[in-house]
């Protein structure tokens, strides 16, 4: 038995926990084992998050915003674990949490700073607006405000337009770049410094191909090793631009190794796919096949866009018939 007059002064410990929007997190807190454990978690020193004492939860005074979202590790309390399991964090949950733990021999208070980040997978889009061509890097929901950088042929570009809309809890950001008439390669990087997460979009324009009607065309699409990790889930989409909009020819999902082909003349080489080569063949070309072909390899961490321009010309036979 310890004397109850024995009070141990423990300085305020402060930890930082980084959570992701809508995901579950743990706010850590530990203490020296003792009898009569009391645990009170509070937010910003005002709102009751969770209370436990006399062997059970006491949530009568819990702030409604935490209802059904908090629990302790009940089997580990006797081992000195007062950590809080926190479900579905939102940006409104950001702030300072204080864990008060009392036992018959001491009382300690731990502070945990919760920061919440959002990074819905960005996208890189290629768009035609009248006679102009644009690359657009966009992220639908991100917090805090990200760092966006563009490079042309691996050289940073200072021009960096950002169209930003702020909702209650995050930003939606578009960063367009006019690439009209350019044959350069472009790279866009979006970085969330809080979540230490970076996404890269890379755009490469291949030399134009001239083909005759009824011939077939081979269009290359191989990921750049710097970004590509075959262990990570990714999707490959081949599409063709017609009158300003892209129609999907085929796509491949690495998770299921499924290939879906919407154009009967399109073919993929399974063996090449296994070697991470997503080059495609389009058979029996006709004049309406002229246009831009886009290969999009996308994962959570990157988008690699490769664009081919194909010109299909009438064969001599067809020309002489006309």
């Amino acid at each position: 038995i310890f004397p109850l007059a024995f009070f141990i002064y423990v300085p305020m410990n402060e930890q930082i926990v980084i959570g992701r929007l809508d995901e579950d997190i743990i706010l850590p807190s530990s203490f020296e084992r003792g009898s009569e454990v009391v645990i009170h978690w509070k937010y910003q020193d005002s709102y009751k998050v969770h209370s436990y004492y006399k062997g059970s939860d006491h949530l009568e005074s819990q702030d409604p915003r935490y209802a059904n979202r908090t629990s302790l590790f009940y089997n580990e309390i006797q081992n000195g674990n007062a950590s809080l399991f926190f479900r579905r964090v939102s940006l409104l949950d950001e702030g300072i949490y204080t864990c008060y733990v009392g036992t018959a021999i001491q009382v300690i208070t731990n502070k945990v700073v919760l920061k919440v980040g959002v990074f819905l997978t960005p996208v890189m889009k290629y768009e035609k607006r009248n006679t102009n061509s644009f690359l657009i890097c966009s992220v639908l929901s991100v917090y805090p405000r990200p760092i966006i950088t563009w490079k042309m042929d691996n050289t940073p570009i200072s021009e960096n337009n950002m169209e930003e809309t702020g909702s209650l809890d995050s930003f939606s950001i578009n960063s367009p770049l006019n690439i009209t008439g350019s044959n350069s390669s472009y790279e866009c990087t979006i970085e969330n410094s809080l979540l230490k997460q970076t996404w890269t979009g890379r755009w490469t324009m291949k030399d134009g191909l001239h083909k005759m009607q009824s011939e077939h065309v081979s269009l290359s699409c191989q990921p750049v090793n710097d970004y590509f990790s075959p262990n990570q889930d990714f999707k490959v989409t081949w599409s063709r631009m017609k009158s300003g909009t892209f129609s999907v020819l085929a796509y491949y999902l690495s998770s299921s190794q499924n290939t879906i082909i919407n154009e009967s003349r399109f073919s993929w080489n399974k063996e090449l796919i296994n070697q991470s080569d997503f080059s495609m063949n389009l058979m029996d070309l006709n004049l309406s096949d002229s246009g831009e072909y886009l290969c999009n390899i996308s994962s959570d961490e990157y988008t690699l866009l490769t664009i081919h321009t194909v010109h299909v010309e009438p064969s001599q036979e067809t020309a002489s018939h006309n």
Epitope: D45, K54, G102, A104
Partner: antibody, heavy 120, light 107 residues
């Protein structure tokens, strides 16, 4: 060591008010719940009120509910009992007492008490 | 609210006697019961908490038992310095009511 010193007691007429104070030292006051307990001289102990370590929860005996208010100032290490509408039956020695932990347990340290006499 | 009763209200015993005091709660309170000793002219002192755990510095002749509604404080061998009034107190939830007390003196 834990020290609790009550003050503010005295003689007061029925219906009047009185405010008791309790100065705490020798422990981290803001970490512990605090109680007021009273005792009519020669009689038994009567629990009066409790306040949690952070002041967020308070509870009272039915006999004082609505008339007495317990409060604390953690920056001053002081506990208070505001007593309004005093009655003759409130005459007692009032003890300030420290809770084992946050304000939900038993008393492990007591002050010496201050006498409140309600008399016309 | 839960009521606390104690019996007997007073007792006289000889030095060396075994003394037993009973405390009863009107509803179950698990083991959330404390015992206090108050000597004449002094402030109360914690003897036992959690129904049976001896507070540090309290002589081992004091012991507590019970759970739910019925609790007992036992002094295995009464000493002259044990002359006092003994109170039980429930602390399962507010109000933290005291029993009326048992006065113990020496024959």
């Amino acid at each position: 060591q834990v020290q609790l010193v009550e003050s503010g007691g005295g003689v007061v007429q029925p219906g009047r008010s009185l405010r008791l104070s309790c100065a705490a030292s020798g422990f981290t006051f803001s970490n512990y719940g605090m109680h007021w307990v009273r005792q009519v001289p020669g009689k038994g102990l009567e629990w009066v009120a409790v306040i949690w370590y952070d002041g967020s929860e308070k509870d009272y005996a039915d006999s004082v509910k609505g008339r007495f208010t317990i409060s604390r100032d953690n920056s001053k290490n002081t506990l208070y009992l505001q007593m309004n509408s005093l009655r003759v039956e409130d005459t007692a020695v009032y003890y300030c007492a420290k809770d084992l932990i946050s304000g939900i347990y038993y008393v492990d340290h007591w002050g010496q008490g201050t006498l409140v006499t309600v008399s016309s | 609210d839960i009521q606390m009763t104690q019996s007997p209200s007073s007792l006289s015993a000889s030095v060396g006697d075994r003394v037993t005091i009973t405390c009863r709660a009107s509803q179950g309170i698990s083991n959330y019961l404390a015992w206090y000793q108050q000597k004449p002219g002094k402030v109360p002192k914690l003897l036992i908490y959690a129904a049976s755990t001896l507070q540090s510095g309290v002589p081992s002749r004091f012991s507590g038992s019970g759970s739910g509604t019925d609790f007992t404080l036992t002094i295995s061998s009464l000493q002259p310095e044990d002359v006092a009034t003994y109170y039980c107190q429930k602390y399962n939830a507010a109000p933290f009511t005291f029993g009326p007390g048992t006065k113990v003196d020496i024959k």
